[in-house]
């Protein structure tokens, strides 16, 4: 996602499972910290946004032709799991310790 | 990058190394096909944009709170190498068959 003036960074995003309709199968937690990647991928791309060569190239092309080519985008580059309690198909409450890819660990410019 | 109405997809982006100032060290090719990921990550996210769970969650939160949370972003999810000819520190033209991460192979919503 892009943000007005700030550089690409990880920001808080509390997600309530009821808001997204997942409370029908996720029993707990009721909400969790998903985080969100926000901010712009501005020239020059800093090391902390771990740019790929393509992102660097696109940033340079955007600099030259801003109306033709977009900036690189600030996105999750590493995700972390959360633990959830859910009802399995037999209706039995089951703990999944590692429900993968649910929370942002790192953001970067891609 | 985001695009107005179209869905996230790979589009052509011809990059001339002179335009980005890399012609000082990349001898050949003079330009290459970098591709660009363009288009929106709209609900529901299709399988072909290989969404992560976090991207699905963010899309659902955006649907509920569009002004608070951004959509997932259409970015390169797989990159390909190109071959380049460059001059080494001895002035000898040298071929790098696999200069990694220079061209988009696949786009997705992240």
């Amino acid at each position: 996602s892009t943000g007005a003036g700030s550089h690409c960074q990880k920001t808080s995003l509390r997600v309530n499972f009821e808001d997204i309709g997942w409370n029908s199968w996720i029993i707990a937690p009721k909400e969790y910290e998903a985080y969100e990647c926000k901010g712009g991928c501005f020239f020059p791309l800093a090391d902390d946004v771990t740019p790929t060569k393509h992102a660097i190239v696109q940033t340079l092309v955007h600099l030259k032709f801003p109306t033709k080519v977009g900036k690189a985008c600030c996105v999750p580059t590493k995700l972390s799991p959360i633990s959830i309690l859910y009802k399995d198909d037999m209706g039995v409450p089951t703990l999944k310790y590692h429900y993968e890819g649910m929370s942002v660990a790192e953001c970067g410019c891609r | 990058s985001t695009g107005a109405g179209s869905h996230c997809q790979k589009t052509s982006l011809r990059v001339n190394f002179e335009d980005i100032g890399w012609n000082s060290w990349i001898i050949a090719p003079k330009e290459y096909e970098a591709y660009e990921c363009k288009g929106g990550c709209f609900f529901p996210l299709a399988d072909d944009v290989t969404p992560t769970k976090h991207a699905i969650v963010q899309t659902l939160v955006h649907l509920k709170f569009p002004t608070k949370v951004g959509k997932a972003c259409c970015v390169p999810t797989k990159l390909s190498p190109i071959s380049i000819l460059y001059k080494d520190d001895m002035g000898v033209p040298t071929l790098k068959y696999h200069y990694e991460g220079m061209s988009v192979a696949e786009c997705g919503c992240r």
Epitope: - | I27, A28, I84, L85, V92, P93, T94, L95, Y97
Partner: antibody, heavy 118, light 111 residues
Framework: QVQLVQSGAEVKKPGASVKVSCKAS????????MHWVRQAPGQGLEWMGE????????NYNEKFKSRVTMTVDKSISTAYMELSRLRSDDTAVYYC???????????WGQGTLVTVSS | EIVLTQSPATLSLSPGERATLSCRAS??????????MNWFQQKPGQAPRFLIY???NQGSGIPARFSGSGSGTDFTLTISSLQPEDTAVYFC?????????FGGGTKVEIK
């Protein structure tokens, strides 16, 4: 600066062998391919083959494959080209030259004249 | 093997004139967007000198009057304003495939 110094002129009889050396300096010897090119009197350039000093891998011109052997001695940064079963039409100046994996021959030795005569 | 044909065999021009040397390959020398074509200059009694590589790039210390162009199978070496010291034989060479091959050469003479 890069220097390739070749051994002196040789006179050989038909059927004999000749071994030309090329001593390299001014760069890391194992970094570039060493090529051998010959030039008969008043003629053009003829590529004989190349050797990668790093692991000793070779690519030979099919024309010379049965008669040529390219070797290196990394300890003294020297490349060798041995041509056997010499004929009168092997009379030529033999050059060593270095290039990268791209194959352009950037630096050349001064040449070694090999005369094959009975 | 790739055959390189150079023309003309001899070129006789006056100082200051423009020299255009041609090299035609029996198959394309392009790969990965790179042209595997090189040019060499050889003066009498000397080793060849690396002039142009990848069709259009000057070797180190090569005067600006030497330029190369072309792609695929047709390549040109241009000497924009001939100098007396440019009297030499010019060879094209392909480095795309083994065996690396040379053209037969073009002799440039100054009138």
């Amino acid at each position: 600066q890069v220097q390739l110094v070749q051994s002196g002129a040789e006179v050989k009889k038909p059927g004999a062998s000749v071994k030309v050396s090329c001593k390299a300096s001014g760069y890391t010897f194992t970094r570039y391919w060493m090529h051998w090119v010959r030039q008969a009197p008043g003629q053009g350039l003829e590529w004989m083959g190349e050797i990668n000093p790093s692991q000793g891998g070779t690519n030979y011109n099919e024309k010379f494959k049965s008669r040529v052997t390219m070797t290196v001695d990394k300890s003294i940064s020297t490349a060798y080209m041995e041509l056997s079963r010499l004929r009168s039409d092997d009379t030529a100046v033999y050059y060593c030259a270095i290039g990268s994996n791209y194959g352009g021959l950037v630096y050349w030795g001064q040449g070694t004249l090999v005369t094959v005569s009975s | 093997e790739i055959v390189l044909t150079q023309s003309p065999a001899t070129l006789s021009l006056s100082p200051g004139e423009r020299a255009t040397l041609s090299c035609r390959a029996s198959e394309s020398l392009d790969n990965y967007g790179i042209s595997f074509m090189n040019w060499f200059q050889q003066k009498p009694g000397q080793a060849p000198r690396f002039l142009i590589y990848a069709a259009s790039n000057q070797g180190s210390g090569i005067p600006a009057r030497f330029s190369g162009s072309g792609s695929g199978t047709d390549f040109t070496l241009t000497i924009s304003s001939l100098q007396p010291e440019d009297t030499a034989v010019y060879f094209c060479q392909q480095s795309k495939e083994v065996p690396r091959t040379f053209g037969g050469g073009t002799k440039v003479e100054i009138k």
